[in-house]
Interface confidence: medium
């Protein structure tokens, strides 16, 4: 068999609620994927699980099943959302993230995706994982790759 | 049409405390922040401070934190000042105007007179 | 605070004159300047903001230069309404901050 190629391609959109109460954060990350098929055969891909983590925290987990086929030669992109909570011992971030005497309250995510896939009774899974910036201050739709974290200092503006 | 439309003029005696309002109009009042801005007779402008609607965040300018308190009624669409304490230097036209996260003003509202005389 | 100072605070032009108003901060605020006309009985209107951005529905006689320090509000070709009062404004930092302002009057 050819190999199932998985690229994370970023973020799409974040969708941020608080609960001031309780100095929570909710963030709904929409992430998306493009999946490869470079046999010459349909392969299903079965199912889709996420995790979201910050500062070395699990933040929020998603699991998607029975996703779709994908046929020979071809390649689908698929969205997924992840529900993430940042709270308790984090609770200190809703005054960062709703602070408004800055303009853009950029966090750094860590998104870990794998992607299992199947074909004549074989399965496979596929793990990527990457740094995301996400703004937690506002809603935001990001173009594809926008959010990336790189880990250089860039210059200033 | 975005519009912000305030309450009426006022005349308060020193040492009182008045809350001014500002009905937002013609778009989705948790979008966008709201800024309030003082402009004394024959002056300039003065920013006192923003009020997210979506999460009732606030930022004062410290020349103004203890003059005023920014509020907001989601459902009624209302921002509102509270001034206490006044004296004549409060005495002026009082602007609500609303701003995205890049900190200018898109729309103003039609301001609000606010006279402090015994 | 960023310091504004607007020059000058009175200017008088004829229509079809072009005329430039400056603004120049204590300290460099990138391109975020933004400029606002006041006009009575009628709401403060945003002209540009970031320096040089047109906001929509404002006529292309509007154009606003400069980054840093320096800025400049140029009207071009002045219409009869266009005599008002402008303002400029920071949006770089907290606390906001204006320019005193200029009186655009018709000579």
């Known amino acids: 068999p050819r190999s199932i190629e998985v690229k994370y391609i970023g973020v799409k959109s974040a969708y941020v609620s608080y609960d001031a109460e309780k100095r929570t954060i909710y963030l709904n990350i929409t992430n998306t994927l493009n999946i490869t098929n470079n046999n010459y055969y349909s392969v299903e891909v079965e199912n889709i699980t996420a995790q979201v983590q910050f500062s070395k925290t699990v933040i929020g987990k998603a699991r998607l099943n029975n996703i779709t086929n994908i046929g020979p030669l071809d390649m689908k992109q698929i969205d997924y959302t992840v529900p993430t909570v940042i709270a308790e011992e984090m609770s200190y971030m809703y005054d960062f993230c709703t602070l408004l005497s800055i303009k853009v309250h950029n966090i750094v995510l860590m998104m870990q995706v794998t992607v299992t896939t199947a074909y004549f009774g074989h399965s496979e899974q596929i793990s990527q994982e990457r740094y995301q910036y996400v703004d937690c201050g506002r809603n935001t739709t990001y173009q594809l790759a926008q959010s990336e974290y790189l880990n250089v200092l860039q210059p200033q503006q | 049409e975005v519009q912000l439309q305030q309450s009426g003029p006022v005349l308060v005696k020193p040492g009182a405390s008045v809350k001014l309002s500002c009905k937002a109009s013609?778009?989705?009042?948790?979008?966008?922040?709201m800024n309030w801005v003082k402009q004394s007779h024959g002056k300039s402008l003065e920013w006192i401070g923003v009020?997210?609607?979506?999460?009732?965040?606030?930022s004062y300018n410290q020349k103004f934190q203890d003059k005023a308190t920014l509020t907001v009624d989601k459902s009624s669409s209302t921002a509102y000042m509270g001034l206490n304490s006044l004296t004549s230097e409060d005495s002026a036209v009082y602007y609500c105007?609303?701003?995205?996260?890049?900190?200018?003003?898109?729309?103003w509202g039609t301001g609000t007179t606010v006279t402090v005389s015994s | 605070d960023v310091q504004i100072t607007q020059s000058p605070s009175y200017l008088a032009a004829s229509p079809g004159e072009t005329i430039t108003i400056n603004c120049r901060a204590s300290?460099?605020?990138?391109?975020?300047l933004a400029w606002y006309q006041e006009k009575p009985g009628k709401t403060n209107k945003l002209l540009i903001y970031?320096?040089?951005t047109l906001q929509s529905g404002i006529p292309s006689r509007f154009s606003g230069s400069g980054s840093g320090t320096d800025f400049t509000l140029t009207i071009s070709s002045l219409e009869p309404e266009d005599f008002a009062v402008y303002y400029c404004q920071q949006h770089n930092e907290y606390p906001l901050t204006f320019g005193a302002g200029t009186k655009l009057e018709l000579k």
């Open positions: 300290r460099s605020i990138s391109k975020y």
């Open positions: 970031s320096g040089s």
């Open positions: 105007a609303n701003g995205n996260y890049d900190w200018y003003f898109d729309v």
């Open positions: 009020i997210n609607p979506y999460n009732g965040a606030t």
């Open positions: 013609g778009y989705t009042f948790t979008d966008y922040y």
